[in-house]
């Protein structure tokens, strides 16, 4: 009678690892499959808030803060306040930002039609010459490749020219010291899919 | 994918108006400026001037200053062309164009305006 | 305003050919050029900027080079779909200027 009751014992201890184990397979396939649709969501949230975002100019939607514009995986703001090289570059800092870096072609052109000033302000941005007649380097030391911008070596400017500006879609090299607008830039955060929700009361509205 | 789609081709009489339209898609509206340039028939490209999509603010190039208005709505993602007091010499294609006035990636698919009485 | 001249105003060549436009300034605009294609009855097509970089999508058959006041683009290799009409055009501030353009056509 022992030795039976220890054997069914065993059985449903047996029986119950095994179940223990399927179970642990389901949920690891289960988290596996979470992680992917949350990725899909991600994707899917991103796409429609870019699409919301560009139809209006602005959403509540956009990972940027207010009154940021979002292009491209970054968030930019442009000032209107006149300060040195340096002190745009601790102001940016301060805003949790660094100074504008152009990447590509595309950001060059956002840049301009951004900074374009019938008043001929100039906007910092973030590459300098850390020594004089050395190489350009933007802020985080990435070097600056010369097929994106041709930098105009500004004559007028009486001291050292190593830091950059840009002015109505030119680049110029400039003496740090000058005043010009700053212009900070900062990685876009993740668009919350919870952001998206429309309220059942306002679907059949417009567009 | 960006697009710059124009309102179709107009035939007018001399001194009579007309208003092209460019809807934009695929970006930003806001984030890049609106030019505008003319192509007479068998002839060059002209730089008309261009708005800034942010102020509203045009600026016009010599040539255009008077009888040509540009124009936006944002809310629609357009910019608008407007020609007043339309003379023979107006009959051209009409091109919207994205960006600052520096050079164009994007391009509409133009606008054939004919003034003829 | 800044003038810019284009030549020649037009050229014959056959497919294979090595072909160069030539562009120049009234006075220095640096780098501050562009290159566009077009065909009859479409768009321009964007080609070079900065007088040398090559837009995304163009084929490496395309270069530009020159700084200052001449510029020049060059088809090394021309293709059946190469055969359209080029314009330079600054952007060295404004007014934005394009040269009258150039006729490539197959001799």
């Known amino acids: 009678q022992y030795y039976q009751l220890s054997n069914t014992g065993q059985d449903t201890i047996s029986q119950m690892e095994e179940r223990l184990g399927n179970t642990s397979q389901e949920l690891q396939s289960l988290q596996v499959q979470n992680i992917k649709l949350a990725g899909s969501l991600q994707h899917v949230a991103e796409k429609l808030c870019r699409e919301l975002y560009n139809k209006a100019g602005a959403h509540r939607c956009s990972p940027c803060t207010e009154q940021w514009k979002w292009h491209g995986d970054n968030c930019y703001q442009f000032y209107k306040d006149s300060k040195s090289w340096e002190d745009c570059k601790y102001f940016c800092l301060s805003e949790n930002s660094t100074m504008l870096k152009i990447n590509k072609q595309e950001d060059l052109e956002f840049a301009a039609s951004q900074s374009y000033s019938e008043f001929f302000y100039s906007y910092w941005t973030g590459l300098l010459r850390p020594d004089s007649g050395k190489a350009w380097l933007w802020m985080d030391g990435t070097p600056f490749t010369s097929e994106l911008f041709h930098i105009i070596i500004d004559v007028t400017s009486p001291r050292s020219r190593d830091c950059v500006a840009i002015l109505n879609g030119m680049i110029f090299s400039k003496d740090c010291k000058e005043l010009k607008r700053c212009v900070c830039e900062r990685r876009a955060g993740m668009v919350k899919p919870e952001s998206l929700h429309v309220p059942p009361e306002t679907l059949g509205e417009g567009d | 994918q960006i697009q710059l789609v124009q309102s179709g081709s107009e035939l007018k009489k001399p001194g009579a108006s007309v208003k092209v339209s460019c809807k934009a898609s695929?970006?930003?509206?806001?984030?890049?400026?609106m030019n505008w340039v003319r192509q007479a028939p068998g002839q060059g490209l002209e730089w008309m001037g261009w708005?800034?999509?942010?102020?509203?603010?045009?600026t016009y190039a010599d040539d255009f200053k008077g009888r040509f208005v540009f124009s936006l709505d944002t809310s629609v993602s357009t910019a608008y062309l407007q020609i007043s007091s339309l003379k023979a010499e107006d009959t051209a294609t009409y091109f919207c164009?994205?960006?600052?006035?520096?050079?164009?990636?994007?391009w509409g698919q133009g606008t054939t305006v004919t003034v003829s009485s | 305003d800044i003038q810019m001249t284009q030549s020649p105003s037009s050229l014959s060549a056959s497919v294979g050919d090595r072909v160069t436009i030539t562009c120049r300034a009234s006075?220095?605009?640096?780098?501050?050029l562009a290159w566009y294609q077009q065909k009859p009855g479409k768009s321009p097509k964007f080609l070079i900027y900065?007088?040398?970089t090559l837009a995304s999508g163009v084929p490496s058959r395309f270069s530009g080079s020159g700084s200052g006041t001449d510029f020049t683009l060059t088809i090394s290799s021309l293709q059946p779909e190469d055969f359209a009409t080029y314009y330079c055009?600054?952007?060295?501030?404004?007014?934005?200027?394009f040269g009258q353009g150039t006729k490539l056509e197959i001799k």
């Open positions: 164009a994205r960006g600052a006035p520096a050079w164009f990636t994007y």
């Open positions: 695929g970006y930003t509206f806001t984030n890049f400026g």
């Open positions: 006075e220095s605009i640096y780098s501050y």
């Open positions: 708005i800034n999509t942010n102020t509203g603010e045009p």
């Open positions: 900065n007088a040398k």
């Open positions: 055009q600054h952007h060295f501030g404004t007014p934005l200027t």
